[in-house]
Structures are given as structure tokens and as C-alpha cells.
């Protein structure tokens, strides 16, 4: 991967990732330097007859660093702070080849919840105000609300009117997704509106 266009690599929080390294064909490699955000990460001297010398120069990531037989970088137990720019410099007798990567750490979505702030009008129409959330949502999470295959909202919030006299039972489903996972949570309009109706009659008495 040339230094002009970094290879963008997705990693999942807590899991492992490999940054693949391609060797110049037929050339003897003198040494390989791996950098993270322009700071030295590891220095590797390959040997033809014995194991390579690997000098890990970044103690923070050191214990989680590994290298494949082709000196690709493996990083385990990924943390959010591993996000950033990685570079590998392969030095041969005649040249230096640079490979660049951008590592992006994504969270597996967890713990989807729906909160409900609904109200009942005197004509018995129920207005649902639903809000969907997931743990540690960031800008890469897409939310949408669906019913019967139609998208009713492209945001965490859904406002919709439901009239039990003319509407059949209806489920509303929140779908949260990012590049590595998706979650969904369904709620019943009938159930939510019945709960509101009970509260409404309780306060009237």
C-alpha cells in the first residue's frame, strides 16, 4: 500500500487485526521499521538462517504486538487508542518501500434500548414518541425505525400517531447498525398505548 493512499483497516474493539505487509519481490530485506502515529513501534532484522531479531520500541502496545512470518503486524485486544496511522518501512540494499495504513476501531453495538414518551389524546388517538439508543453510540452508528418493511424514521427518534379504532396491531422496530454489527428492538404500539391508556384513566379517577 503506497504512502500516498493509506489502506484503511477496520478493527473491532477487544479483538485482533492484521496490517498486511507485502515484500519487494526477490530482494533481500535488511530491516523493517513499524511506526504508529510517526512514533517507532518495532524494529525487525530478518535473518536467513535463524529467527528474526524483533525489537519492540513501544511498551504501551508491546504485549499486544505480534508479527507474522511475513512481518505483517498483528495487534490483539484492540483499544480505542489504537486508532491512527501506521507505517511500515522495508529497507533493502537498493531502496526503501513504504506502506501506510489507517486503523479505525469500531465497537460491536451493545445494549439496544427504547424509551417511550407517549400521550393519549381525547379522541383516543395515541401519539408515540419513541427514542432508541445503544451503548457508546458514535457518529458511525446509523439508526432507523421500520414498520412492515417501511422506514418511518432515519434517526434515533420516532414520532407517530396510532389510532386503535382504525389501525391493526403494529410493531415498530428500531435498527441500529455500524460497519461491524447491527441490533434491533421491536415495540408494540398496542401495548404502549394500552399502558398510556391505563395511566390516563388512573389520573382521571
Amino acid at each position: 500500500q503506497s504512502s500516498l493512499t493509506p489502506l484503511m483497516v477496520n478493527g473491532i474493539l477487544g479483538e485482533s487485526v492484521t496490517l498486511p505487509l507485502e515484500f519487494p519481490a526477490g530482494e533481500k530485506v535488511n530491516f523493517i521499521t513499524w511506526l504508529f502515529n510517526e512514533t517507532s513501534l518495532a524494529f525487525i532484522v530478518p535473518h536467513e538462517t535463524k529467527s528474526p531479531e524483533i525489537h519492540v520500541t513501544n511498551p504501551k502496545q508491546g504485549k499486544r504486538l505480534n508479527f507474522t512470518q511475513s512481518y505483517s503486524l498483528q495487534l490483539s485486544n484492540l483499544k480505542m487508542e489504537d486508532t491512527g496511522s501506521y507505517r511500515a518501512q522495508i529497507s533493502t540494499k537498493t531502496s526503501a518501500k513504504l506502506s501506510s495504513y489507517t486503523l479505525r476501531i469500531l465497537r460491536q453495538l451493545r445494549n439496544i434500548q427504547v424509551t417511550n414518551h407517549s400521550q393519549l389524546f381525547q379522541n383516543m388517538t395515541c401519539e408515540l414518541h419513541l427514542t432508541c439508543s445503544v451503548e457508546d453510540a458514535d457518529d458511525n452508528v446509523s439508526f432507523r425505525w421500520e414498520a412492515l418493511g417501511n422506514t418511518l424514521s432515519s434517526q434515533p427518534n420516532l414520532t407517530v400517531s396510532w389510532d386503535p379504532r382504525i389501525s391493526s396491531e403494529q410493531d415498530y422496530t428500531c435498527i441500529a447498525e455500524n460497519a461491524v454489527s447491527n441490533l434491533s428492538f421491536s415495540v408494540s404500539a398496542q401495548k404502549l398505548c394500552e399502558d398510556v391508556k391505563i395511566q390516563y384513566t388512573d389520573t382521571k379517577m
Epitope: 489502506l7 484503511m8 483497516v9 477496520n10 489507517t102 479505525r104 457518529d139 458511525n140 446509523s142 432507523r144 425505525w145 421500520e146 422506514t151 418511518l152 424514521s153 432515519s154 434517526q155 434515533p156 427518534n157 420516532l158 414520532t159 407517530v160 435498527i175 447498525e177 455500524n178 460497519a179
Partner: antibody, heavy 118, light 106 residues
Framework: QIQLVQSGSELKKPGASVKVSCKAS????????MNWVRQAPGQGLEWMGW????????RYADDFKGRFVFSLDKSVSTAYLQISSLKAEDTAVYYC???????????WGQGTTVTVSS | QIVLSQSPATLSLSPGERATMSCRAS?????MHWYQQKPGQAPRPWIY???NLASGVPARFSGSGSGTDYTLTISSLEPEDFAVYYC?????????FGGGTKVEIK
């Protein structure tokens, strides 16, 4: 039917400000995010960011942080794009586009041409 | 940000021919959307979530792909298909568009 109608073309001098409107009709405005997309003359499409039409919270792409402001008037189902300290390179067609989910822009405004020239 | 590279930049074909255009992402994405734009007009939604045709799009259009490589194919070009086609990813912010492929009459 569902549509987004944008305000008319604007000719402005460098340093001035402009406010582009995007009026939505035919759907529940607060249920769908509104995106803004820029297209410079003869160029491709550039996503500027979006605004959550329920909460009013804007999100800007890095290149559009600072001089660009997204806002709403929910009472008239309208989204706005304001650009301050206009530069010649802001000359472009600006589109509003509804997000149908997964940032798929299913309805687009007709575009507003902003020309910045001294 | 995820960079989308569309190729070729221009496709010069005759009506009735098959058109295939590519969109390559700098990182794996979950799905790709496609838009059609004609001169002086706003973009129109064309294909969403990789392979689903937008309302009113003829069946001669199809979309496919996964990971970093996505394709839009027109099985037999009609005069109204000559336009610019843009791909767009949603997996990562900022939502980025490709540079476009112009399908022009040969």
C-alpha cells in the same frame, strides 16, 4: 407528495453571508435526518454533514466546520444552511437531501446556486 | 475518511450496449448507494444498499458487490441512461461519494 423545495440562486460578494432554505413537505419532518451536499462547478458531490431534525443537533464533515451552520425551524418544516465569510471557492450548487436510513438520500431539493464574486 | 474511487471516469458506449462501472472503497464498507445525475439537475436516488433499485428505476440496472468492490451494471443502454453515476458509502462518517462515472454516447 414528498418534496424538498430550496430557496433561489444567490449572488454574493466575498466576506458576505448567505442563508439557504430547504422546505420539506409530504412527510413528518422530525422523523428524517436532513443532509447538505455541495457540488462545485463541473465537480462531484461532497457531503457537508447533516442535522438531526428531532433534536436539532448538527454534525459537520471536517471540511465544513467553522463557517457553515445547519439549523431548523420545525414549525415550518424547514432546514437552513448558513455560510459566513464567503469565499470564491464556496461558489457551488448546494443541495439538501433527506436521509431515508443508512444515509441513503431518497429525496433531494432542486439545488441552490450560490455564486461568490467581487 | 473512506475514499471511493470510481472507474472508468468516462464510459463511451452506444445504445444497446452493456455498461459496467466500478466503485472501489479504501476500506471495507457494509453497503453502497448509487445516484444518477443529469446536467442541470439534482442527483436522483438510483440503487440503495448495494442492490435494491430505487422507485421507478428500470430493471436493466443492477448493483452488486461487497467489502471494498462494488459494481453498477446497465444490461442494455437506453438513450435516457446517459448521465453521471455516483456511488456513496454510509459505513463511516464522513459519508463520502465517489468522483462519478460519466456514461456518454459514443
Amino acid at each position: 407528495q414528498i418534496q424538498l423545495v430550496q430557496s433561489g440562486s444567490e449572488l454574493k460578494k466575498p466576506g458576505a453571508s448567505v442563508k439557504v432554505s430547504c422546505k420539506a413537505s409530504g412527510y413528518t419532518f422530525t422523523n428524517y435526518g436532513m443532509n447538505w451536499v455541495r457540488q462545485a462547478p463541473g465537480q462531484g458531490l461532497e457531503w457537508m454533514g447533516w442535522i438531526n431534525t428531532y433534536s436539532g443537533e448538527p454534525r459537520y464533515a471536517d471540511d465544513f466546520k467553522g463557517r457553515f451552520v445547519f439549523s431548523l425551524d420545525k414549525s415550518v418544516s424547514t432546514a437552513y444552511l448558513q455560510i459566513s465569510s464567503l469565499k470564491a471557492e464556496d461558489t457551488a450548487v448546494y443541495y439538501c437531501a433527506r436521509d431515508y436510513g443508512r444515509w441513503y438520500f431518497d429525496v433531494w431539493g432542486q439545488g441552490t446556486t450560490v455564486t461568490v464574486s467581487s | 475518511q473512506i475514499v471511493l474511487s470510481q472507474s472508468p471516469a468516462t464510459l463511451s458506449l452506444s445504445p444497446g450496449e452493456r455498461a459496467t462501472m466500478s466503485c472501489r472503497a479504501s476500506s471495507s464498507v457494509s453497503h453502497m448507494h448509487w445516484y444518477q445525475q443529469k446536467p442541470g439537475q439534482a442527483p436522483r436516488p438510483w440503487i440503495y444498499a448495494t442492490s435494491n433499485l430505487a422507485s421507478g428505476v428500470p430493471a436493466r440496472f443492477s448493483g452488486s458487490g461487497s467489502g471494498t468492490d462494488y459494481t453498477l451494471t446497465i444490461s442494455s443502454l437506453e438513450p435516457e441512461d446517459f448521465a453521471v453515476y455516483y456511488c456513496q458509502q454510509w459505513s463511516s462518517t464522513p459519508r463520502t461519494f465517489g468522483g462519478g462515472t460519466k456514461v456518454e454516447i459514443k
